[in-house]
Amino acid sequence: HKSSSQGQDRHMIRMRQLIDIVDQLKNYVNDLVPEFLPAPEDVETNCEWSAFSCFQKAQLKSANTGNNERIINVSIKKLKRKPPSTNAGRRQKHRLTCPSCDSYEKKPPKEFLERFKSLLQKMIHQHLSSRTHGSEDS
């Protein structure tokens, strides 16, 4: 049980890191292709992982202008990196009732990133609220 909770913590630390990558990309929002992308909001309970995968699948792209192309492309690539599998993620994969990615409202990059960040924060909040007190190393 301890190693499973440590695995969950490590996983959530990855989510924590993704928030910083989203924040980094928000600095370069004017250098992103102004395309409308599916952006889940007010995601229903137990559909968080489904919504997360929608954000990861979205075609966020650099507009290939200026000096920021490299950092933008690296950041997008890191956002799309598959997180380590967890029991919570596996359980949610079997839910067939979650909305499809295409059913979510499409938003420009700025709002897309804001909604992605909100979802990540919600997932961390749920994780930290559901476990006993003690640090990520305990």
């Epitope: 913590d9 490590r10 959530m12 630390i13 924590r16 890191q17 910083d20 990558i21 924040d23 980094q24 690296v74 950041s75 890191k78 924060q121 961390i124 909040h125 930290l128 640090s135 990520e136 190393d137």
Partner: antibody, heavy 116, light 107 residues
Framework: QVQLVQSGAEVKKPGASVKVSCKAS????????MHWVRQAPGQGLEWMGT????????IYSQNFKGRVTMTRDTSTSTVYMELSSLRSEDTAVYYC?????????WGQGTLVTVSS | DIQLTQSPSSLSASVGDRVTITCRAS??????LNWYQQKPGKAVKLLIY???RLHSGVPSRFSGSGSGTDYTLTISSLQPEDFATYFC?????????FGGGTKVEIK
């Protein structure tokens, strides 16, 4: 147990560069990002930036952009912070800090004095 | 950038006292608020993360609370080793920012 051991104090002239190291042990080095924070004499804490040791990805504070470079050496589990074009106001204690859900473990600090 | 205003900037207290330090953010930080302890010549220590979670090895006399923009660190019964400077830090948005610190001194 988690330990972050930083390099020793440095004295530098204005315009020079300084490179501070932070050697990590007691955990999987590539699992946690490392942040750098500084504290000028009698002042508060100021965030400088962060590095992901798994791939050298960095995010820098706008206050230091163009002057700071963070790197890592996975073979020795060490991260480095180099600050260039030093000025007297860069005199401070520089800290590395591991980031989990917060800056959960800190190095002992490295005093960098910039003086002509 | 998110500003964090800590108060008081210093306080004098006696062993056994209950001490409360507050941290106000310039915008809602959704509980992404951490508290640290700093002693001269020692490594900074994390006390509380995500508003109220006690870090490993931290005595239970330390507690945190709050939401939105207002957060509190409480030491229920001050011990001799608690005389130090305390900082809050927000983890909601880059750049990471810190409060100005609260120095807890012996009365």
């Amino acid at each position: 147990q988690v330990q972050l051991v930083q390099s020793g104090a440095e004295v530098k002239k204005p315009g020079a560069s300084v490179k501070v190291s932070c050697k990590a042990s007691g955990y999987t080095f590539t699992d946690y990002w490392m942040h750098w924070v500084r504290q000028a004499p009698g002042q508060g804490l100021e965030w400088m930036g962060t590095i992901d040791p798994s791939d050298n990805y960095t995010i820098y504070s706008q206050n230091f952009k163009g002057r700071v470079t963070m790197t890592r050496d996975t073979s020795t589990s060490t991260v480095y912070m180099e600050l260039s074009s030093l000025r007297s106001e860069d005199t401070a204690v520089y800290y590395c800090a591991r980031y989990g859900f917060a800056m959960d473990y800190w190095g002992q600090g490295t005093l960098v004095t910039v003086s002509s | 950038d998110i500003q964090l205003t800590q108060s008081p900037s210093s306080l004098s207290a006696s062993v056994g006292d209950r001490v409360t330090i507050t941290c106000r953010a310039s915008q809602d930080i959704s509980n992404f608020l951490n508290w640290y302890q700093q002693k001269p010549g020692k490594a900074v220590k994390l006390l509380i993360y995500y508003t109220s979670r006690l870090h490993s090895g931290v005595p239970s006399r330390f507690s945190g609370s709050g939401s939105g923009t207002d957060y509190t660190l409480t030491i229920s019964s001050l011990q001799p080793e608690d005389f130090a400077t305390y900082f809050c830090q927000q983890g909601h948005t880059l750049p990471r920012t810190f409060g100005g610190g609260t120095k807890v001194e012996i009365k």
